[in-house]
């Protein structure tokens, strides 16, 4: 079988065998090696010499196999825009950012550029849980039956109503979507405003 050509090698049809790791150089009509992630082209290829790569300097990176003559500058996450760093920049990957807790991404340009505060969910509702953090503003949904939530908050969850009998007490007032059950000692009389509702 034919030995596989090693870059640089001639290419008549302007395509290279390994599209990820090689590129077509039109001046010499050859296929040359790309530089691996974390490196850049320090010397271009010729008919007799393959690409020479060098490591990206500190605070710069290249994420992919490339034939770039420079590395990209690392950019910090912009905390003024509500972003926080979740992984620092390395020679092979740019800084990874996301919105801080309590914020959502309000502006995208290939990646999130600006986060804003999540809106509050009013009493009787809670924020619908999303799979991914920081991806959208709160969508408030009513507490399900038997649950309540009594604050205006972006993060408060509906809680189950207290079961008075579990505490050896009796119900004085039923819970609502916005308030918990009121319990009382079984020996205490009902407050005057509720005495009319008692079955004798």
């Amino acid at each position: 079988s034919q030995p596989q050509a090693v870059p640089p090698y001639a290419s008549e049809n302007q395509t290279c065998r390994d599209q990820e790791k090689e590129y077509y150089e039109p001046q010499h009509r050859i296929c040359c090696s790309r530089c691996p992630p974390g490196t850049y082209v320090s010397a271009k290829c010729s008919r007799i010499r393959d690409t020479v790569c060098a490591t990206c300097a500190e605070n710069s990176y290249n994420e992919h196999w490339n034939y770039l003559t420079i590395c990209q500058l690392c950019r910090p996450c912009d905390p003024v825009m509500g972003l926080e760093e979740i992984a620092p920049c390395t020679s092979k990957r740019k800084t990874q950012c996301r919105c801080q807790p309590g914020m959502f991404c309000a502006a995208w340009a290939l990646e999130c550029t600006h986060c804003e505060l999540l809106s509050d969910c009013p009493p009787g509702t809670e924020a619908e849980l999303k799979d991914e953090v920081g991806k959208g503003n709160n969508h408030c949904v009513p507490c399900k039956a038997g649950h309540f939530q009594n604050t205006s908050s972006p993060s408060a969850r509906c809680q189950p109503h207290t079961r008075c009998e579990n505490q050896g007490l009796v119900e004085a007032a039923p819970g609502t979507a916005q308030s918990d059950t009121t319990c009382k000692n079984p020996l205490e009389p009902l407050p005057p405003e509720m005495s009319g509702t008692m079955l004798m």
């Epitope: 509500g82 926080e84 760093e85 979740i86 801080q100």
Partner: antibody, heavy 114, light 107 residues
Amino acid sequence: EVQLLESGGGLVQPGGSLRLSCAASGFTFSYYAMTWVRQAPGKGLEWIGVINSGGGTYYTDSVKGRFTMSRDNSKNTLYLQVNSLRAEDTAVYYCAKASTADVWGQGTTVTVSS
Amino acid sequence: DIQMTQSPSSLSASVGDRVTITCQASQGISNYLSWYQQKPGKAPKRLIFAASSLESGVPSRFSGSGSGTDFTLTISSLQPEDFATYYCQQYNSYSLTFGGGTKLEIK
């Protein structure tokens, strides 16, 4: 160098309260969310909650209504007010930088016992 | 909440051994996983973030791999100072969760 220094722990009776502090240096504190984590004796790590740069808070269910996180960005200080303490709250309490908890303080010990 | 299951819970090994600790998430967490080392009486120290990126100053004998739900911490050649407890932690969710820990002891 990022440094976090917790203080305010101690021995407290069940039902009692403490205010834990975390003094931050070496980074722009006001820009970062901050996290509290605790570790009961001989046990694993438990996330307590996170506070964002503007003071918005998220808590784990077991401490909701009893613990309150706050911060003073002008003093580069984070606080955890712990109320209605129970025996099971006995632990070393750590503050950590960012919601990812990338750098931790040395911890402060809270012992709840009668 | 996302559950993190770490195994083994304890491990005896000798200096020079290659050691592997695994961590499984109850749902996909992309590469939002850190590994921490904790020595008795000390705070946890982050060794690895984003599943495989080494913190600066951490020896290259430590490595991490995995994505999605299954992750691995490997120590290629154990040194005396590596005997400690190791924890995985997910940060895909703001409510961080930790594995139960792996206590690495001298055989």
